[in-house]
């Protein structure tokens, strides 16, 4: 056959679906690879062909669209399973072609099992709610296109294993779940089960997401440098190890990159002719506020090093701050025996 533009296996799209539930999968060609949509392709006389490779097999085979009750079907650029079976797992390929043009892409589909509490190997999306921030909602995800707007499905929400009813601050409102005020205790996995009829059959869609309650933007502040500070003086003798911690608190901020760094005499540490190492550790609070510590270490400090300016810098989306450490050379204690002897006129 003539050459086909093969976009390979699109591992960016790890599609996971639950066993015994409907699944609709759009051909990724039109979403990520080609600059035209299915309608344009169809009207230009291009045909979309589907085939697959079973799990642990190398043989590409056509998809059987003649199964009882049309279990697998294709509609425009969508491959439908009504419902899926465990052995539908494999790599699926959609190919767009006519006599002069050909383009194809493969993607992995994994059919996974869930238990009665909705636990499964499914990768769960995380939805962050701000703590004590007022009413916030989560929406049952990825259910568009499964049934027409004329169909009114029933939606049941669960937290973990438990049906949400008569919860203090969590109220099911159809496709939405409203949190009147979010607390740490609201952390957990939330599942919506959407039940709808189709051609005399009843289908269920199960969607689980993880809710994480995080710090509120109302309380967010620029980075706070706890150390170095004005109360601590790093007094060292030449030859000793100099250790200066820079400890910075960062409020949780959605999509903010938190950074801590040192400068020595206003320069990058590597630009100074000294053997300096910097080690970083990070810890998080329950609401994802972050504390970063960068310890600047000079194994054998010289008197020249003790005259330098050591500044800790911190930056987040809320701003940038800097604080200098107070570094001094230790003044040797007086040697009393000699000095007292001199005082008494001894020679």
């Amino acid at each position: 056959s003539e050459r086909c533009d093969d976009w390979g296996l699109d591992t960016m799209r790890q599609i996971q679906v639950f066993e015994d539930e409907p699944a609709r999968i759009k051909c990724p060609l039109f979403e990520h690879f080609l600059k035209f949509n299915y309608s344009t392709a169809h009207s230009a006389g291009l045909t979309l062909i589907w085939y697959w490779t079973r799990q642990d097999r190398d043989l590409e085979e056509p998809i059987n669209f003649r199964l009882p009750e049309n279990r697998i079907s294709k509609e425009k650029d969508v491959l439908w399973f009504r419902p899926t079976l465990l052995n539908d797992t494999g790599n699926y390929t959609c190919m767009l072609r006519n006599t002069t043009y050909c383009s194809k892409v493969a993607f992995p589909l994994e059919v996974v099992q869930k238990d009665s509490c909705f636990n499964s190997p499914m990768k769960l999306p995380v939805h962050k709610l701000y703590i004590e921030y007022g009413i916030q909602r989560i929406t049952c995800p990825n259910v568009d296109g499964y049934f027409p707007s004329s169909v009114k499905p029933t939606i049941t929400w669960y937290m973990g294993c438990y049906k949400i009813q008569n919860f203090n601050n969590v109220i099911p409102e159809g496709m939405n779940l409203s949190f009147l005020i979010a607390f740490i205790s609201n952390n957990g996995n939330y599942t919506c089960v959407v039940t709808y009829p189709e051609n005399g059959r009843t289908f269920h869609l199960t969607r689980t997401l993880t809710v994480k309650v995080v710090g509120s933007p109302k309380n967010a502040v620029p980075p706070v440098i706890h150390s170095p500070n004005d109360h601590v003086v790093y007094e060292k003798e030449p030859g000793e190890e100099l250790l200066i911690p820079c400890t910075v608190y960062f409020s949780f901020l959605m999509d903010s990159r938190n950074e801590v760094w040192w400068t020595i005499d206003g320069k990058k540490p590597d630009d100074i002719p000294i053997d300096v190492t910097i080690n970083e550790s990070i810890s998080h609070s329950r609401t994802e506020d972050e504390t970063r510590t960068q310890i600047l270490s000079i194994k054998k400090v010289t008197s020249e090093d003790l005259k330098r300016s050591y500044v800790c810098h911190a930056r987040s989306a809320k701003g940038e701050v800097a604080k200098a450490a107070t570094v001094k050379q230790k003044v040797p204690a007086p040697r009393y025996t000699v000095e007292l002897a001199c005082g008494f006129g001894a020679t």
């Epitope: 990159r257 950074e259 990058k268 590597d270 970083e280 810098h313 930056r315 701050v321």
Partner: antibody, heavy 118, light 113 residues
Framework: QVQLVQSGAEVKRPGASVKVSCKAS????????MHWVRQAPGQGLEWMGW????????DYAQKFQDRVTMTRDTSISTAYMELSRLRSDDTAVYYC???????????WGQGITVTVSS | DIVMTQSPDSLAVSLGERATINCKSS????????????LAWYKQKPGQPPKLLIY???TRESGVPDRFSGSGSGTDFTLTISSLQAEDVAVYYC?????????FGGGTKVEIK
């Protein structure tokens, strides 16, 4: 001395992926961000993203978000950039460059030519 | 994204004369808390990677000749070559690193008149 040495030129077909490497020497690899910048033939410089080799954290330009993956191996002081679903307009010289936070990109790799052609 | 606009596109200057390149950012790139402008200037010769000349809009990178200087603040910046030398023939780029995606100007080609 401080240097970044990149892997050799690559020729790829549309739809394929390319993974290029950048080996750092002469400085503390984990102490500097590593950027990837590309330059199409006769064109200007385009920033693709950066990786913090210490934490592995990344920040990609929106344009490349769904196609680029930046990784590192601190044991061999090497950064990697993988670009998937290559198109002919990805033909360019790809540079790695280090920066100490907000001090500009002070050391650059020699660049690697990636040609995408059917 | 912050757009960086360089002018002119190209510049022909006699040896020993002053060359001035302008760069304008579509929004402020000064950090009010540190009073630093997050702007760098690079020089690129054909077939070579770029070379950092200036960071923080006006701080010269070590080893860069003092005929190169950077100035400006907020949204308007200038790179000046006080006395053009033959080895200064190159394309010059400005770049903002105030916020990601870090963006470059389109470049200014400097030639000898």
């Amino acid at each position: 001395q401080v240097q970044l040495v990149q892997s050799g030129a690559e020729v790829k077909r549309p739809g394929a992926s390319v993974k290029v490497s950048c080996k750092a020497s002469g400085y503390t690899f984990t102490g500097y961000y590593m950027h990837w910048v590309r330059q199409a033939p006769g064109q200007g410089l385009e920033w693709m993203g950066w990786i913090n080799p210490y934490s592995g954290g990344t920040d990609y330009a929106q344009k490349f978000q769904d196609r680029v993956t930046m990784t590192r191996d601190t044991s061999i002081s090497t950064a990697y950039m993988e670009l998937s679903r290559l198109r002919s307009d990805d033909t360019a010289v790809y540079y790695c460059a280090r920066s100490y936070y907000y001090y500009g990109m002070d050391v650059w790799g020699q660049g690697i030519t990636v040609t995408v052609s059917s | 994204d912050i757009v960086m606009t360089q002018s002119p596109d190209s510049l022909a200057v006699s040896l020993g004369e002053r060359a001035t390149i302008n760069c304008k950012s579509s929004q402020n790139i000064i950090n009010s808390s540190t009073n630093k402008n997050y702007l760098a200037w690079y020089k690129q010769k054909p077939g070579q990677p770029p070379k950092l000349l200036i960071y923080w809009a006006s701080t010269r990178e070590s080893g860069v000749p003092d005929r190169f200087s950077g100035s400006g603040s907020g949204t308007d910046f200038t790179l000046t070559i006080s006395s053009l030398q033959a080895e200064d023939v190159a394309v010059y780029y400005c770049q903002q690193y105030y916020s990601t995606p870090f963006t470059f100007g389109g470049g200014t080609k400097v030639e000898i008149k």
